[in-house]
């Protein structure tokens, strides 16, 4: 491949250049922008992502980056000034310039001899820059998201194209298509590819129809498909649930607001460990399930489910996935049991006029120091399973 001539500011003595073979993607990403197709340019070095040198940033590199990311061509290439008040404001969007009076060394440069990413090379420690960073806004400012699914990793599939968020039609929508969505969003793999009406219908345009991914694509817009012009309505909006999405249920209680806490994560129902199950976690879960607030955290029972999830909340989060959490795949809740909770909306709290001496009760020892009494009703017996 032709190698671009190094500009004056290139520190060739310490530079290690890499040229990208056909079929390899340019190791670049855009950050701090409005979508995955705009923002500050970062290049991947061996173990980290580093901002690309603004001093050596030009329209050819901008075009190549946009194409490499599947974002069309470059609409505007610019430089972002360093956060120091003495420097002049950054050039207006669309301007491309090379900084003078370069003083600092060490930033990687992205050098392109043409607008195709295969004609680019990353040169480490190459740039003596004034601290400005390369920025670009691509013409096809594309982005992807999952909405109305209770988290960033589940919901109706929406693409941003031409400045508008729109749906994807569920015709031919399958797990391979959903895999691409999940991977692109950093949400693991697809657990479900859902047809329309599993989530609330969208309102904007329908951007794609007959999507047919192989599953290997990096971006949904790389998949074969048709423009979603006339043949789909929002009742056919495609949806996806990814492995990193968390959903919760309470099992074995009188109703959905009482019981053992289980989280669906990475394709299976997992226990939540009661060794770190405190009032704040119970409160967040009850509220997120629409079950009011936590009233009781009964001691856990032995269980045989896979998975071992721990949460740490401050009590103000909307869902447990907004809390600090960790998933220990090799340790079944250590020495603890599965967490349980009784929420205020459970019917077991209502119409319970406990007499002075309880009538028919069942007593079960669940720990050396704790006994639980369960009223002898059919609906309660499940709690002991």
């Amino acid at each position: 491949h032709p190698s671009p001539a190094p500009p004056d500011q290139l520190n060739t003595s310490s530079a290690e250049s890499e040229l990208w073979e056909p079929g390899e993607r340019l190791p670049v990403r855009l950050t701090n922008g409005s979508s995955s197709c705009s923002g500050t340019v970062e290049v991947r070095l061996e173990a980290s992502w580093e901002p690309a040198c603004g001093a050596l940033w030009d329209s050819r590199a901008a075009e190549a980056v946009c194409r490499a990311l599947g974002c069309g061509g470059a609409e505007a290439a610019s430089q972002l000034a360093p956060p120091t008040p003495e420097l002049p404001p950054p050039p207006a969007a669309g301007n491309t310039s090379v900084a003078a009076n370069a003083t600092l060394a060490g930033a990687p440069a992205l050098l392109c001899s043409g607008a195709e990413w295969r004609l680019c090379e990353v040169v480490e420690h190459a740039c003596r820059s004034d601290g400005r960073r390369a920025r670009v806004t691509c013409a096809e400012n594309r982005a992807l998201r999952l909405v109305d699914g209770g988290g960033a990793c589940a919901g109706r599939v929406e693409m941003l194209e031409h400045g508008e968020w729109g749906s994807v039609c569920d015709d031919t929508w399958d797990l391979e298509d959903a895999h691409v969505v999940c991977r692109q969003l950093g949400c693991g793999w697809a657990v479900q590819a859902l047809p329309g009406l599993h989530f609330t219908p969208g309102r904007g345009p329908i951007h794609r129809d007959q999507v047919n991914c192989s599953g290997a694509e990096a971006y949904l817009w790389d998949c074969p498909g048709l423009p979603g012009q006339h043949y789909c309505g929002h009742k056919e909006d495609a949806g996806a649930v990814c492995s990193e999405h968390q959903s919760w249920r309470l099992t074995g209680g009188a109703d959905r607001c009482e019981g053992q806490v289980e989280v669906h994560f990475r394709g299976v129902w997992n226990t939540v460990c009661d060794s770190e199950w405190y009032p704040s976690e119970a409160k967040v879960l009850c509220q997120s399930l629409g079950c009011g607030t936590a009233v009781e955290r009964p001691k856990g029972l032995p269980h045989s489910l896979s998975g071992r999830m721990y949460y740490s909340c401050n009590g103000e989060e909307l869902t447990l996935s907004n809390c600090s959490w960790r998933f220990n795949n090799s340790n079944l809740c250590s020495q603890s049991l599965a967490a349980r909770v009784l929420c205020s909306a459970s019917r077991s709290l209502h119409n319970l006029s406990t007499p002075e001496v309880p009538a028919s009760v069942q007593t079960v020892t669940i720990e050396s120091s704790v006994t639980v009494k369960i009223e002898n009703k059919e609906s309660r017996e499940l709690m002991l399973l």
Epitope: P279, K283, T293, E296, S312, L342, L352, V370, V372, K373
Partner: antibody
Framework: EVQLVESGGGLVKPGGSLKLSCAAS????????MSWVRQAPGKGLEWVAT????????YYPDSVKGRFTISRDNVKNTLYLQMSSLRSEDTAMYYC????????????WGQGTLVTVSS | DIQMTQSPSSLSASVGDRVTITCKAS??????LTWYQQKPGKAPKTLIY???SLADGVPSRFSGSGSGQDYSLTISSLESDDTATYYC?????????FGSGTKMEIK
Amino acid sequence: EVQLVESGGGLVKPGGSLKLSCAASGFKFSRYAMSWVRQAPGKGLEWVATISSGGSYIYYPDSVKGRFTISRDNVKNTLYLQMSSLRSEDTAMYYCARRDYDLDYFDSWGQGTLVTVSS
Amino acid sequence: DIQMTQSPSSLSASVGDRVTITCKASRDIRSYLTWYQQKPGKAPKTLIYYATSLADGVPSRFSGSGSGQDYSLTISSLESDDTATYYCLQHGESPFTFGSGTKMEIK
């Protein structure tokens, strides 16, 4: 104002029984879990029993399990502790305590009723 | 069960002194710790809840700190009215457990 008034304490022989009551007022009794905590003369505090707001869940430490029974009547706004097979080491001041709704600590206490187990 | 180790068991200090009582849990209790003051012949009174929150009506000379396993109650300027026994309680996990108490005397 939250008020918890214990009654029913007294002198009882070893092996005997006694029933304590705690009358609650000034708050919605049926919404709160309630507990009994005791304190032997010159000793520290020891949790004895807890009952959830609706009475579905009951907790005891090993030291009283099988001998003490906690119950409540949400209509009468009263908490009970039925004590049987009493031992000399059960001699203590017994306090009724309300459990905080959000954080679970004992936020209100009664003045206590003294139980003396002696022959 | 979580064990609470409270120290010292007794303390003698002068009016105006700054005093600190500590409680150590046998494992992390995530700030679910309450401090109580009990005067002779009286019921316990809540001073500090959730490790650092001052209960209603409690003078600001009382403060709580700590996290994880280690917690402390500090009286910034001791007053004669502070003669009492102080207890910690962990309420993160059932069974709830108290510290053994610290008897505070004024010199």
